[in-house]
């Protein structure tokens, strides 16, 4: 049961994460005009990966797409690429993980196939999440650099009393959405990978459990249970199974850094 829960939860968390990555990629507020310590303007600027917008205090909003490809900064292109790769990998991962879900029966699919698909989708989610986090972080770094550069020469004099005030940009809502979404996708991927371990069919060379009966060593191989992945030979003749009834989904859970989720 724990495997199904872990797998299901990993799928749902990843689904939310990828939806967030898509939302962040489409959002216009990757960078927003810095209002702190600035002359108060009746115009508010914000920018996304695909277009820049201006919202006037009148309520009128005007957005203009970046219709050039070659004229855009390389960093922006890199961020776009990272986000798209993240979405594509995530979408493929979702597709794969649907078929890998233990609660969904598709023909006579082997557990081993489901385990492999779960692992594949988990890895895809991890990479997808990392791509999103990387993309958002690159953009954030770009903003921080530009912010301090524009602060250094915020008021660029134009001779006499005339001054032009440079618009400074700070973190927009999309960055936070992207970071959270990337993190969720990453966590979902890790959960899928953990679930994969529980799904994997065990080695068939079961370890023998010895019982001392009337002076003779009788090798007893318990049937109907999944063997644990025993490391090394069981030389001490200790009983491997506790004999209690256990469903095929139950696995030993080890504390991990993701336990807080």
């Amino acid at each position: 049961m724990a495997v199904t829960a872990c797998q299901g939860l990993g799928f749902v968390v990843s689904l939310i994460g990828i939806a967030g990555i898509i939302a962040a990629t489409c959002m216009d507020q990757w960078s927003t005009q810095d209002l702190y310590n600035n002359p108060v303007t009746a115009v508010f600027n914000y920018q996304g990966l695909w277009r820049s917008c201006v919202r006037e205090s009148s309520g009128f909003t005007e957005c203009r797409g970046y219709f050039t490809l070659l004229g855009l900064p390389a960093m922006l292109q890199a961020v776009r690429a990272l986000m798209i790769v993240g979405i594509v990998l995530g979408a493929i991962g979702l597709l794969v993980s649907i078929f890998a879900l233990k609660c969904i029966r598709i023909g006579s699919m082997e557990d081993s196939a489901k385990a492999n698909m779960t692992l594949t989708s988990g890895i895809m989610f991890i990479v997808s999440g990392l791509c999103a986090i990387a993309g958002v972080s690159v953009f954030a770094n770009m903003l921080v650099t530009n912010f301090w550069m524009s602060t250094a020469n915020m008021y660029t004099g134009m001779g006499g009393m005339v001054q032009t005030v440079q618009t400074r940009y700070t973190f927009g809502a999309a960055l936070f959405v992207g970071w959270v979404a990337g993190g969720l996708t990453l966590i979902g991927g890790v959960m899928m990978c953990i679930a994969c371990r529980g799904l994997a069919p065990e080695e068939t060379n079961y370890k023998a459990v010895s019982y001392h009966a009337s002076g003779h060593s009788v090798a007893y191989k318990p049937g109907g249970f999944k063997a644990s992945t025993g490391f090394g030979s069981n030389t001490k003749n200790k009983k491997i199974y506790d004999g209690g009834a256990r469903t095929e989904d139950e696995v030993q859970s080890y504390p991990s850094k993701h336990d807080y989720v």
Partner: antibody, heavy 118, light 113 residues
Framework: QVQLQQSGREVVRPGTSVKVSCKPS????????IDWVKQRPGQGLEWIGG????????VYNEKFKAKATLTADKSSMTANMQLSSLTSDDSAVYFC???????????WGQGTLVTVSA | DIQMTQSPSSLTVTAGEKVTMSCKSS????????????LTWYQQKTGQPPKLLIY???TRESGVPDRFTGSGSGTDFTLTINSVQAEDLAVYYC?????????FGAGTKLEIK
């Protein structure tokens, strides 16, 4: 068509208050900001402040912050400006105007003449 | 506050002439986000409220005759009236629509001979 109907002229005593109203018609009241502008006789135009009738958010010219209070009543679809502690300097024509794209004022009320006289 | 300086304060012309009036702002009114200049021109005839002529420095309001043209960018702006008509007798104001408080110029009074 868009119209802004302002209340009639007012003659008031110094130190008292007056409320000037502006009732727009021909458009959705809550969709546009209403601004107020002062014009002293034979003088130029001074922006007092603006109000978003939908949210009630206001923005003031610092010069008029202690003088003017802008409100909007959605039920009667009326924008109001209360002027307090009146002096002779407050004798002027007060216009309300609708703010549109470019933050410009495309429709204006006919103006309300406020005379502060002892 | 942003200072809006209009010149000349008044001018007298003959009907049919071309008129230009200037407006200078103490800071640039150009918004980098959309490359628009937040400057507006109004016409006010005696006893009437102002009338919107041009916004975004050069966009003519609907219904305004095409003899009215706005130009300029940053801090220097011009209103041109090609072939002045008798009905153009009025005071013309420019307005900063970018920075709060929104400020007006002192006006240019146009008189017809």
């Amino acid at each position: 068509q868009v119209q802004l109907q302002q209340s009639g002229r007012e003659v008031v005593r110094p130190g008292t208050s007056v409320k000037v109203s502006c009732k727009p018609s021909g458009y959705a009241f809550t969709n546009y900001l209403i601004d107020w502008v002062k014009q002293r006789p034979g003088q130029g135009l001074e922006w007092i402040g603006g109000i978003n009738p939908g949210s009630g958010d206001t923005v003031y010219n610092e010069k008029f912050k202690a003088k003017a209070t802008l409100t909007a009543d959605k039920s009667s679809m009326t924008a109001n400006m209360q002027l307090s502690s009146l002096t002779s300097d407050d004798s002027a024509v007060y216009f309300c105007a609708r703010r549109v794209r470019g933050n410009s004022f495309d429709s204006w009320g006919q103006g309300t003449l406020v005379t502060v006289s002892a | 506050d942003i200072q809006m300086t209009q010149s000349p304060s008044s001018l007298t012309v003959t009907a049919g002439e071309k008129v230009t009036m200037s407006c200078k702002s103490s800071q640039s009114l150009l918004n980098s986000g959309n490359q628009r200049n937040y400057l507006t021109w109004y016409q006010q005839k005696t006893g009437q409220p102002p009338k919107l002529l041009i916004y975004w420095a050069s966009t003519r309001e609907s219904g305004v005759p095409d003899r009215f043209t706005g130009s300029g960018s940053g801090t220097d702006f011009t209103l041109t009236i090609n072939s002045v008509q008798a009905e153009d007798l009025a005071v013309y104001y420019c307005q900063n629509n970018y920075y709060y408080p929104l400020t007006f110029g002192a006006g240019t009074k146009l008189e017809i001979k």
